[in-house]
Interface confidence: low
């Protein structure tokens, strides 16, 4: 019979013959022959392979470097890589999360619209009319201006997006 030119799923072609791939979590030790099956071995302690493969070496688990602000989110197994995330107050610079940067603070005049997470930065929004923020903060929202009327006071100085209104006593009418 003609030697196969294409192999079934989870097989590979070598020396004109189809050999079984190694399953996830195992590496190739020797190809199959006419008389023997593919020989595979489990990956070591800090190694993994996440696909059916013919790799002769397993990949090293990712190292979550604390010097880069990283910590382990999920420990790797023989079939999965370690997943890193950032320490509190930091977020990943990329989807692969290879390093972290400090969460952005919203400047005065801006408030937090969405709190930062391990993978996304703070989202700021300008304080609308009637609201202000006088601090640079990674989690404070815009605060509403003080209502002078409810305190039986009048506005002495208008508020801005960065400052609250200043209230003062009402002028008494002189007789």
């Amino acid at each position: 019979p003609e030697p196969p030119t294409a192999c079934r799923e989870k097989q590979y072609l070598i020396n004109s013959q189809c050999c079984s791939l190694c399953q996830p979590g195992q590496k190739l030790v020797s190809d199959c022959t006419e008389f023997t099956e593919t020989e595979c071995l489990p990956c070591g302690e800090s190694e993994f392979l996440d696909t059916w493969n013919r790799e002769t070496h397993c990949h090293q688990h990712k190292y979550c470097d604390p010097n880069l602000g990283l910590r382990v989110q999920q420990k790797g197994t023989s079939e999965t890589d370690t997943i890193c995330t950032c320490e509190e107050g930091w977020h990943c610079t990329s989807e692969a999360c290879e390093s972290c940067v400090l969460h952005r603070s919203c400047s005065p005049g801006f408030g937090v619209k969405q709190i930062a997470t391990g993978v996304s930065d703070t989202i700021c929004e300008p304080c609308p009319v009637g609201f202000f923020s006088n601090v640079s903060s990674a989690f404070e929202k815009c605060h509403p201006w003080t209502s002078c009327e409810t305190k039986d006071l009048v506005v002495q100085q208008a508020g801005t997006n960065k400052t609250d209104v200043v209230c003062g006593p009402q002028d008494r009418l002189r007789a």
Epitope: T85, I115, T117, G118, F139, E140
Partner: antibody, heavy 117, light 107 residues
Amino acid sequence: QVHLQQSGAELVRPGTSVKVSCKASGYAFTNYLIEWVKQRPGQGLEWIGVINPGSGGTNYNEKFNDKATLTADKSSSTAYMQLSSLTSDDSAVYFCARLDGGAAASWGQGTLVTVSA
Amino acid sequence: DIVMTQSQKFMSTSVGDRVSVTCKASQNVGTYVTWYQQKPGQSPKALIYSASYRYSGVPDRFTGSGSGTDFTLTISNVQSEDLADYFCQQYNSYPLTFGAGTKLELK
């Protein structure tokens, strides 16, 4: 070992205030946010707000803007929540919890506040 | 505010069963969801964070799944100690919000 120790139960009169404390140990107090959560008897959990003990910055659930004031004392690694103008609706168990990236993995044991004449 | 809806207030189960507690967010929260277990007279205990990651020490019969707006906590091979209230919480944006809770009870 992270531990949050809350102050004991309080029986208070309507219209008064109460201050609940949450003493943290086993970690760097200023490195994690502390949140406060309300639970009325037999009810669900209600988020009050959060404080950054390092900066004193806060974020409140608008519902509690005029009810709760969150503060923190770095020197004693203690977070506080003051509840003012108390009514029977404020009778509840109040929890403090440490936020780890947004999720509360460590909780205090809870403080029961009972408002009664 | 983001509303987290746990449509089933009570769920009946038997020891050894598999049960799924669901939670629906009123808007996309990515995977920023935590599941908590609470037993009477105790503080809530975090089981799952980022929708699907188990906290250390949590038995592997607890599994979280979902993203966007639909989330599920599955307990396979329910044990008597799993009878408790289960709450979901989103931490995608302020104010953080909880579901109303689902009480798991024996049939």
